[in-house]
Interface confidence: low
């Protein structure tokens, strides 16, 4: 089922069929699918609190002096929570010794705000996008991406860090949200569900898509991620929904075909460089934008979210590979790595196109409740 204004206009696809079938789904304890206390009431099909590397596992951008001529990318530490190997659970992990963050995990103690107070902030992510209520903002120009078509060498690090699969991006990938709003891409990662259960972070009118890609960027105004955390516009994430289509997506297959190599939590492999822009929708002009937060602790706010209107199509087999190949810590499947949608609390989502206007003949004349000017508050 597709929702108005969120359909795939020109799917990315093609390529040959992959040979390997991944592991199938494992029954997960019901705890993983229960809402948390900070969830909006009545929300269904939610896992517990999120535990992906997502935005919180950001590479650190070092000053150029440390590595002549290029930016050095390193993972910030993440955290590990104990898990009962008899009861598979998705837990965060510890990448390095000396982590100073508290433990956090899906659907259990401690509550995220206890891990990081910002997680109780008023302007959190992800959110439910309601196109009818979005403010059409003609000033939102098409996104500009430069340097996203990478050559095969040097190879890139693809890592299963226990709560997502993350591709570390090299220096030189530049993105502009508009004049004077320039960013550098740091990493991309995915969010997914389980067999028959969607796992996107953002939703559209309550509809959850099978999966979602996030490409995380650092503002050029900052040299390091830790400097940008919590600063308005310091970080920007490009997000796109992934859904099922009839053809294999050859761009994604370059990553998905390597997942079995990193099935074990903490493992990594090297993959040839690829066209990162091919992992995103082709229409850079139609998107929703709002200010939110990282979707995992430390839940830092001030993050500019850009959610494409167009979706990306993957084959059913590819979506199955994504959701059923990786393992997390202990005896847990790496599945359902998404956070519940958070209240807007007065925020207005902007749209670069008139999203409230539905071309469907059955649709009533829409009422545009918000304007672009109101969205800046």
């Amino acid at each position: 089922q597709r929702l108005p204004r969120m359909q795939e206009d020109s799917p990315l696809g093609g390529g040959s069929s992959g040979e390997d079938d991944p592991l199938g789904e494992e029954d997960l304890p019901s705890e993983e699918d229960s809402p948390r206390e900070e969830d909006p009431p009545g929300e269904e099909d939610l896992p517990g609190e999120e535990d992906l590397p997502g935005e919180e596992d950001l590479p650190e951008v070092k000053p150029k002096s440390e590595e002549e001529g290029s930016l050095k990318l390193e993972d910030l530490p993440t955290v590990e929570a104990p898990g009962d190997p008899q009861e598979p659970q998705n837990n965060a992990h510890r990448d390095k010794e000396g982590d100073d963050q508290s433990h956090w995990r899906y659907g259990g103690d401690p509550p995220w705000p206890r891990v990081s107070p910002a997680c109780a902030g008023r302007f959190q992510s992800p959110v439910d996008i309601r196109p009818q209520l979005a403010a059409f903002c003609p000033a939102l120009r098409p996104l500009e991406l430069l340097g996203f078509q990478l050559p095969p060498l040097p190879e890139l690090r693809l890592r299963n860090n226990g709560h997502s699969v993350q591709l570390t991006l090299p220096p030189g990938l530049e993105m502009a949200l508009g004049p004077g709003r320039e960013y550098r891409a740091l990493q991309l990662h995915l969010h997914w569900g389980a067999a028959g259960r969607p796992g996107s972070e953002h939703t559209v009118e309550g509809h959850r898509f099978p999966a979602e890609i996030h490409v995380v960027h650092l503002s050029t105004a900052f040299a390091r991620v830790d400097e940008a955390l919590g600063r308005p516009g310091g970080l920007a994430v490009l997000a796109a929904f992934l859904e099922e289509g009839p053809e294999e997506n050859s761009a994604y297959e370059q990553l998905l075909s390597r997942l079995e190599e990193i099935a074990e939590e903490g493992s990594e492999t090297q993959v040839p460089g690829l066209d990162i822009s091919a992992l995103l929708p082709s229409d850079f002009s139609r998107y929703f934008q709002y200010e939110g937060s990282l979707t995992t602790p430390p839940c830092a706010q001030g993050v500019i979210w850009t959610v494409f209107n167009q979706t990306v199509m993957l084959s059913a087999k590819q979506l199955h590979t994504l959701s059923d190949t990786l393992w997390g810590p202990g005896d847990s499947r790496l599945q359902l790595n998404f956070r519940a949608t958070q209240p807007l609390n007065g925020r207005v989502i902007e749209a670069s196109f008139p999203a409230g206007v539905d071309s469907s003949p059955r649709a009533a004349e829409p009422v545009q409740l918000n304007s672009c000017l109101a969205a800046g508050d």
Partner: antibody, heavy 119, light 107 residues
């Protein structure tokens, strides 16, 4: 080509100990999880123990828990199984096998080494 | 633990005929199932993984199907070199468990 060669089997008295070794070659040993699987005479296959590529995750069958210890030395491309408090029920051919990836199917097996526990 | 039950225990098939082996899991293993062939005096050999994907260098006459709790290994045209014991194994949950095996011979 991938090769797994077990050694260390033999005749041991009940209550005794043995240490099995598995020498791996033809692949990047440190990238693969490994398991020991045994087969009693005329019987089927029984998984014994598992160790992840880095050695950080280990599992045992209930039948050997507390008596057997799996380990690996990635620098030496070697897998080990220390077997203590052996009983007649441990008599079997012991195979070391490579997982295609973490916890996946076993795609390469050694020829096995025979352990006989008898007085 | 998940108990894997194979049937029949012994299967006699005429040369060139189809052999169908069954494997049942006591609870769902989704597609986390492998099939192995073991000839007398030899180590097991991986035939099928993820329930239906043939391993490297395995001929197309071997095919696997099923998911959840019911699985089938089919040998489309049995030849003398296929005489062996065939085992199924689940790797979806610990401990890893094997079926008791099906002995296939020529009628």
């Amino acid at each position: 080509q991938v090769q797994l060669v077990e050694s260390g089997g033999g005749l041991v008295q009940p209550g005794g100990s043995l240490r099995l070794s598995c020498a791996a070659s033809g692949f990047t040993f440190s990238s693969y999880s490994m398991s020991w699987v045994r087969q009693a005479p005329g019987k089927g296959l029984e998984w014994v123990s598992y160790i992840s590529s880095s050695g950080s995750t280990i599992y045992y069958a209930d039948s050997v828990k507390g008596r057997f210890t799996i380990s690996r030395d990635n620098a030496k491309n070697s897998l080990y199984l220390q077997m203590n408090s052996l009983g007649a029920e441990d008599t079997a051919v012991y195979y070391c096998a490579r997982h295609r990836s973490y916890r996946f199917a076993l795609d390469y097996w050694g020829q096995g080494t025979t352990v006989t526990v008898s007085s | 633990e998940i108990v894997m039950t194979q049937s029949p225990a012994t299967l006699s098939v005429s040369p060139g005929e189809r052999a169908t082996l069954s494997c049942r899991a006591s609870q769902s293993v989704s597609r986390g199932l492998a099939w192995y062939q073991q000839k007398p005096g030899q180590a097991p050999r991986l035939l099928i993984y993820s329930a239906s994907t043939r391993a490297t260098d395995i001929p197309a006459k071997f095919s696997g199907s099923g998911s959840g709790t019911e699985f089938t290994l089919t040998i489309s045209s049995l030849q003398s070199e296929d005489v062996a014991v065939y085992y199924c194994q689940q790797y979806n949950k610990w401990p890893l468990t094997f079926g008791g095996g099906t002995k296939v011979d020529i009628k």
